[in-house]
């Protein structure tokens, strides 16, 4: 995997330095490299029943390097680990395992989900939506005049999209029936959406209940709607910033 692999030479007596190949500083016929040239890492490679010393520019997959004063040495990570910081802490697992707090697991613990891109266990993220925006003007075929019964809609934004195992988002559009003071459209008002409207109480038997927009009637798990509105969120961010105690590096 890495350059500078020092290999043993034939017809060499044990512990003879001359004629070592690649990055070896000292080597033997039987054991290969015994020590490496500066900055190279010494690793033991298993070949059949014996271990051969090799010198590498960096430690191979499944090993981590320690720079001792007299030798740079590669040490094996745990069996299920591809890259590690040391024996205790894995930083990348072998295929089929998920990394969680330095350990390699077959399955992620409860409350976490597998990210198949990073192969790590990550927190489940649920959908978060904003508060509803105000209802739109009561309209019919895009007009706010010349009719009695129309519809009004309201929308809310998705603040946080859910992860694979997270709760799905609830509908983000709602439409309901509404009534307006019947008035004739003025000249030039035809087809225009007005900003103001008078609203009558619904007639007997006429529903004023909100129905989700057909576009947003996806199958969804319910989530609490006790969400902060945008202003509250902004306010909180500003307060958090003001509270921050930050120390910058002195160069």
């Amino acid at each position: 995997q890495n350059a500078s692999r020092g290999r043993r030479q034939r017809r060499m007596h044990p512990n003879v330095s001359q004629g070592c190949q690649g990055g070896c500083a000292t080597c033997s016929d039987y054991n290969g490299c015994l020590s490496c040239k500066p900055r190279l890492f010494f690793a033991l490679e298993r070949i059949g029943m014996k271990q051969i010393g090799v010198c590498l520019s960096s430690c191979p997959s499944g090993y981590y390097g320690t720079r001792y004063p007299d030798i740079n040495k590669c040490t094996k990570c745990k069996a299920d680990c591809d890259t590690c910081f040391n024996k205790n802490f894995c930083t990348k697992c072998k295929s089929g395992f998920y990394l969680h707090l330095g350990k390699c697991l077959d399955n992620c613990p409860e409350g976490l989900e597998a990210n198949n891109h990073t192969m790590e266990c990550v927190s489940i993220v649920h959908c978060e939506v904003s508060e509803w925006n105000p209802w739109s003007p009561c309209t019919k075929k895009g007009k706010t005049c010349g009719f009695k019964r129309g519809t009004e809609t309201r929308v809310r934004e998705i603040i946080q999209h859910p992860s694979a195992k997270g709760n799905l988002c609830p509908p983000t559009n709602e439409t309901r029936k509404c009534t307006v003071q019947r008035k004739k459209c003025q000249k030039g008002e035809r087809g225009k959406k007005g900003r103001e409207r008078k609203r009558k109480k619904p007639n007997k038997g006429e529903s004023k209940e909100a129905i989700p927009d057909s576009k947003s009637l996806e199958s969804s798990k319910e989530i609490p709607e006790q969400r902060e509105n945008k202003q509250q969120q902004k306010k909180r961010k500003v307060q958090d910033k003001q509270k921050s105690v930050s120390v910058s590096t002195v160069h």
Partner: antibody, heavy 116, light 107 residues
Framework: EVQLVESGGGVVQPGRSLRLSCAAS????????MAWVRQAPGKGLEWVAT????????YYRDSVKGRFTLSRDNSKNTLYLQMNSLRAEDTAVYYC?????????WGQGTMVTVSS | DIQMTQSPSSLSASVGDRVTITCLAS??????LVWYQQKPGKSPKLLIY???RLQDGVPSRFSGSGSGTDFTLTISSLQPEDFATYFC?????????FGQGTKLEIK
């Protein structure tokens, strides 16, 4: 549960000797390099010495070279620090630690006071 | 030896504050940096390894970042139990060296 228990600390006069021990349990002692890290009163952490897993190599900070000797007995899961020619500046809490690039496991420490 | 310079040496903050401690290495140490927390009369406890990876059992309000020579430990919202002394350590090569520590005190 990983445990490292230091012993052997105490008050000693300058120039005298002291031997610290560290009994390990709860992990494979023979797989780990072991170290001593010290902390003078009100000061920071200072690495003292490390012995590799099989006891074949030892490393010391310059200020203790030639005075301190680190050894281990893997059959007894015990680490030792022989401290000779002690000086006032060696006064500190001495921690035994499993050293694998980071210091993953620590003992509770033993106080060494060098004073006349 | 690689010198590790930590700043500040002490810091006063309140519960709920966001706190940042920095560590500067005298040469490139890649991401071979460890952070420890030490409470009075106790031994140090490993918090973060490989500059940014949380040790098992460490709350997620702790985070580490940086690579090369500049590193940061951040506590997003201080809790009463976080008031302690924090040390960085380079694990790039022997001899292992520590920063001088940052004492985090209640304001």
């Amino acid at each position: 549960e990983v445990q490292l228990v230091e012993s052997g600390g105490g008050v000693v006069q300058p120039g005298r000797s002291l031997r610290l021990s560290c009994a390990a349990s709860g992990f494979t002692f023979s797989d780990y390099d072991m170290a001593w890290v010290r902390q003078a009163p009100g000061k920071g952490l200072e690495w003292v010495a490390t012995i590799i897993y099989d006891g074949s190599r030892t490393y010391y900070r310059d200020s203790v070279k030639g005075r301190f000797t680190l050894s281990r007995d893997n059959s007894k899961n015990t680490l030792y620090l022989q401290m000779n020619s002690l000086r006032a500046e060696d006064t500190a809490v001495y921690y035994c630690a499993a050293h694998d690039r980071s210091f993953d496991y620590w003992g509770q420490g033993t106080m060494v006071t060098v004073s006349s | 030896d690689i010198q590790m310079t930590q700043s500040p040496s002490s810091l006063s903050a309140s519960v709920g504050d966001r706190v940042t401690i920095t560590c500067l290495a005298s040469e490139d140490i890649s991401n071979d940096l460890v952070w420890y927390q030490q409470k009075p009369g106790k031994s140090p406890k490993l918090l973060i390894y490989a500059a940014s990876r949380l040790q098992d059992g460490v709350p997620s309000r702790f985070s580490g970042s940086g690579s090369g020579t500049d590193f940061t430990l951040t506590i997003s919202s201080l809790q009463p139990e976080d008031f302690a002394t924090y040390f960085c350590q380079q694990s790039y090569k022997y001899l292992p060296t520590f920063g001088q520590g940052t004492k985090l005190e209640i304001k």
